[in-house]
């Protein structure tokens, strides 16, 4: 299987976004790639996003996606938005060497993503 | 467990032509991969020669283009290299080797030693 | 092509010994950099492949860094069956091309 390294623990800004990045060793230049970013909590495994992306150009997510992200050689930045704080989960960052075969899967460790819900700005009297 | 096995003759006359092969067993050639020649001149560094891909494509050190051609055949999952040409600078040890595209190489022969000369 | 200037040529050491080897790519090729062993009559044996990680079966001496031009092989403690001759190799660009080989050998 092919080594996946993401980082273990993000915390999420207070606007709700998380960036992390995850490094596949891939044994070559593959043409093709598929990365998908999974979310477990409770034992429960959800995909959260996906994108496939030709070497050498941007990670194109759909339109709806919460997810964006750049991609530099054998590394994807990807970026979570509109977290909030039942969003707290482990997520998991899979590569797939789609293209040339043969066909290579990695899976990260997860990186723990926390996310606290700010505080709501209390009236001010003037 | 992949293995990769090269023959040939061992004795070469300058100006003719070199025929290896190299036999692979566990992996079919057709999967998936590149499968690539690489030689080491005596006391040397590796020098790449070119592979085919699983798909039947070549690619060749352009210092070598002119006179190497390397071939497969399916049924019996082998590759050949053949060298034109061949002078006392071709005398080396040739690897037969696998690769993912433009990747490190896993899998190597154990080497077959060509003697160019007359 | 990429040149991959590699040093030392040689290098003596001992057995418990930590050892660096440098490999110096003429232009960026990232992170696609692998080190090979090859002891005499055999074939070369991959190590570490891109830049850092180990080999199936290598042991946790062996070690790898750098990224861009710059690349190096670490051997933490010298192990008596070590000594034996490295090679660098980068696989960003085609032409694929080695380094000319460390030989490392007993002091």
């Known amino acids: 299987a092919m080594h996946v390294a993401q980082p273990a623990v993000v915390l999420a800004s207070s606007r709700g976004i998380a960036s992390f990045v995850c490094e596949y060793a891939s044994p070559g230049k593959a043409t093709e790639v598929r990365v998908t970013v999974l979310r477990q909590a409770d034992s429960q495994v959800t995909e959260v996003c996906a994108a496939t992306y030709m070497m050498g150009n941007e990670l194109t997510f759909l339109d709806d996606s919460i997810c964006t992200g750049t991609s530099s050689g054998n590394q994807v930045n990807l970026t979570i938005q509109g977290l909030r704080a039942m969003d707290t989960g482990l997520y998991i960052c899979k590569v797939e060497l789609m293209y040339p075969p043969p066909y290579y899967l990695g899976i990260g460790n997860g990186t723990q993503i926390y996310v606290i819900d700010p505080e709501p700005c209390p009236d001010s009297d003037f | 467990q992949v293995q990769l096995q090269e023959s040939g003759p061992g004795l070469v006359k300058p100006s003719q032509t070199l025929s290896l092969t190299c036999t692979v067993s566990g992996y079919s050639i057709t999967s998936g991969y590149y499968w690539n020649w690489i030689r080491q001149h005596p006391g040397k560094g590796l020098e790449w020669i070119g592979y085919i891909g699983y798909d039947g494509s070549n690619y060749y050190n352009p210092s070598l283009k002119s006179r190497v051609t390397i071939s497969r055949d399916t049924s019996k999952n082998q590759f050949s290299l053949k060298l034109s040409s061949v002078t006392a600078a071709d005398t080396a040890v040739y690897f037969c080797?696998?690769?993912?595209?433009?990747?490190?190489?896993?899998?190597w022969g154990q080497g077959t030693t060509l003697t160019v000369s007359s | 092509d990429i040149q991959m200037t590699q040093s030392p040529s040689s290098l003596s050491a001992s057995v418990g010994d930590r050892v660096t080897i440098t490999c110096r790519a003429s232009?960026?090729?990232?992170?696609?950099v692998a080190w090979y062993q090859q002891k005499p009559g055999k074939a070369p044996k991959p190590l570490i492949y891109s830049t850092s990680y180990r080999y199936s079966g290598v042991p946790s001496r062996f070690s790898g860094s750098g990224s861009g031009t710059d690349f190096t092989l670490t051997i933490s403690s010298l192990q008596p069956e070590d000594f034996a001759t490295y090679f660098c190799?980068?696989?960003?660009?085609?032409?694929?091309?080695f380094g000319a080989g460390t030989k490392l050998e007993l002091k």
């Open positions: 190799h980068q696989y960003d660009t085609y032409p694929l091309t």
């Open positions: 232009q960026n090729v990232g992170t696609y």
């Open positions: 080797a696998r690769n993912y595209y433009s990747g490190y190489f896993d899998f």
